[in-house]
């Protein structure tokens, strides 16, 4: 699931035990404070209509695997968020699967069809910018700009886990024209849908569009990074971008492998393995501390692929901000 959340064990996809994805693993949510506002957001994220109840997750068979972790202690939504990830969350304190949260939504299935099997942004720099393509019956199709809107772009960005839509109606450059069949036009999204397939549209394959009308979308990359305070772009205190806000990274567990991934991602050569004293010369940051306990193997192409605690969860001060010095 691109949204990293699902309901398991119900009679249909819109009810069941709540499961969320973290670092490629699916786990449950503790029912500590779980209420109808949280379910409302979850139902919206899944394209399942309105919330109808907060049943205990233990009601749904089969029960959670013993090895499966409870990942979140509490979710606190106001009810207006688009996704559960936008709600306040606390990492787990103490919770067993007897306390798993459940949810049921009113609308079990979207009435719209066809149902494509995926969406991607192609020929862009990274997976969060590019030409909109949808997959249907193992074939990728482009999407015509006719009827495309900011609301549709918001859905795509959300579906891809790419944050908010930044650029929504740019035509493709000639080199980025699609060579695939044109899937559909007249996308009529409300902006609340969990996936593009939940939006009504004109019949697929029946349109008068050309590839110079292919839709290009750019989303805020959820995981940008930079080095600040140094003499050049390849040295300084590390900051990462999340929810449109730059924040620092705590040095707990930080080492050579993490340095190498940052230098690689920035195109800054290799890490110069700076001393503790050299790292401290960039001073402490201010504002958010976004990441803690980052663990890389060194093979990753992006810090995004490394393990870390939930965004914003740390036990650090800015005196522990990471700095990195690359060869340039």
């Amino acid at each position: 699931s691109p949204s990293g959340v699902r309901l398991v064990g119900g009679l249909h996809r819109c009810e069941g035990r709540v499961e969320v994805e973290q670092k490629g693993q699916w786990g449950t949510v503790c029912d500590d404070g779980w209420d109808i506002k949280d379910v409302a957001v979850l139902c919206r994220e899944l394209g399942c209509g309105a919330a109808s109840g907060t049943p205990s997750g233990i009601l749904y068979e089969p029960p959670a695997e013993k090895e499966q972790k409870v990942l979140i202690q509490s979710v606190s939504c106001t009810g207006t968020e688009d996704t559960l990830a936008q709600c306040e969350q606390e990492e787990v304190y103490d919770c067993s699967h007897d306390e798993d949260a459940g949810a049921s939504c009113e609308n079990p299935e979207s009435s719209f069809s066809p149902v494509p099997e995926g969406v991607r942004l192609a020929d862009g720099p990274g997976h969060c910018k590019g030409r909109v393509e949808v997959k249907h019956q193992n074939q990728w199709y482009t999407v015509c700009q006719t009827g495309w809107s900011l609301r549709a772009a918001k859905v795509v960005c959300r579906q891809l886990g790419c944050g908010r839509a930044v650029l929504t109606q740019k035509r493709c450059n000639k080199h980025a024209y699609g060579r695939k069949p044109i899937w559909l036009s007249q996308m009529s999204c409300s902006g609340r849908e969990a996936t593009l397939q939940d939006c009504p549209s004109g019949p697929w394959g029946k349109n008068t569009c050309n590839h110079d009308e292919d839709t290009w979308v750019e989303c805020e990359d959820p995981f940008d990074l930079r080095l600040v305070g140094g003499d050049n772009l390849c040295s300084g205190r590390l900051e990462v971008l999340h929810k449109g806000v730059w924040g620092s990274v705590c040095d707990d567990n930080w080492g050579e492998k993490e340095d190498q991934v940052v230098c690689k991602q920035l195109g800054c050569g290799k890490s110069l393995s700076p001393s503790f004293r050299d790292r401290k010369c960039y001073g402490p940051g201010v504002g958010r501390i976004w990441l803690d306990n980052v663990r890389c193997s060194g093979e990753e192409q992006s810090l995004e692929q490394c393990q870390h605690r939930f965004w914003g969860f740390h036990d650090c001060t800015h005196q522990e901000d990471v700095a990195v010095i690359c060869s340039g």
């Epitope: 972790k69 606390e90 990492e91 304190y93 103490d94 036990d315």
Partner: antibody
């Protein structure tokens, strides 16, 4: 369900000491364990905890002085460099102020003296 | 630094009387009500009386009552019994980019 502390003894200042909390009937992958101490004639003092997801949290005063770790049935508290002020009865316990459960051991006495 | 201040440090009450203990937190506890009250007698571990600020733990007599929210909490013992002579502690759970617990300094209840 029960928890039991062990490892308390007389040690000289600066000698690292590890206390062990042995749990039974508790799945540590689902439950958090706290360490609390009580100096003679004094009140209860929270040291820190290890959560069900294996994250550790410490009181500000305890950071760097104590380390909490666990395996499948035990939770250890290491006093890295004890001083005479660390003389106390040390309890391990499962509690969470919003929930009805509360499970405490009988405590183990640690005496730091030269 | 989180701080739970309990008052008074010591209180004396006659059998059948009422004891009120206050607990003030330097910041709001988790979800405004994650505060519990414990009773401890000499040589024993603490015993849970009240959790979630006002909910009576199993097997605890109804003469114990908890109230309050946010940063200000109260434990009231009505119709004090001889067996209530003990030290009472408030305990709060907090969340701020991580979990924390704290105990109040304790209140000794002497029954005359």
């Amino acid at each position: 369900q029960s928890v039991e502390e062990s490892g308390g003894r007389l040690v000289t200042p600066g000698t690292p000491l590890t206390l062990t909390c042995t749990v039974s009937g508790i799945d540590l992958s689902s439950y958090a364990i706290n360490w609390v101490r009580q100096a003679p004639g004094e009140g209860l003092e929270w040291i820190g905890m290890i959560s069900s997801s294996d994250n550790t949290y410490y009181a500000n005063w305890a950071k760097g002085r104590f380390t909490i770790s666990r395996d499948s049935t035990t939770v250890d508290l290491k006093i890295t460099s004890p001083t005479t002020e660390d003389t106390a009865t040390y309890f391990c316990a499962r509690f969470y102020a919003g929930r009805s459960y509360s499970l405490w051991g009988q405590g183990t006495l640690v005496t730091i003296s030269s | 630094e989180l701080d739970l201040t309990q008052t008074p440090a010591s209180v004396s009450a006659a059998v059948g009387g009422t004891v009120t203990i206050s607990c003030q937190s330097s910041e709001s506890v988790y979800k405004s009500n994650y505060l519990s009250w414990y009773q401890q007698k000499a040589g024993q571990p603490p015993k849970l009386l009240i959790y979630a600020a006002a909910t009576l733990a199993s097997g605890v007599p109804s003469r114990f009552k908890g109230s309050g929210s946010g940063t200000q909490f109260t434990l009231t013992i009505s119709g004090v019994q001889c067996d209530d002579a003990a030290t009472y502690y408030c305990q709060g759970t907090y969340y701020s980019s991580g979990w924390y617990n704290a105990f109040g300094g304790g209140t000794e209840v002497v029954v005359k």
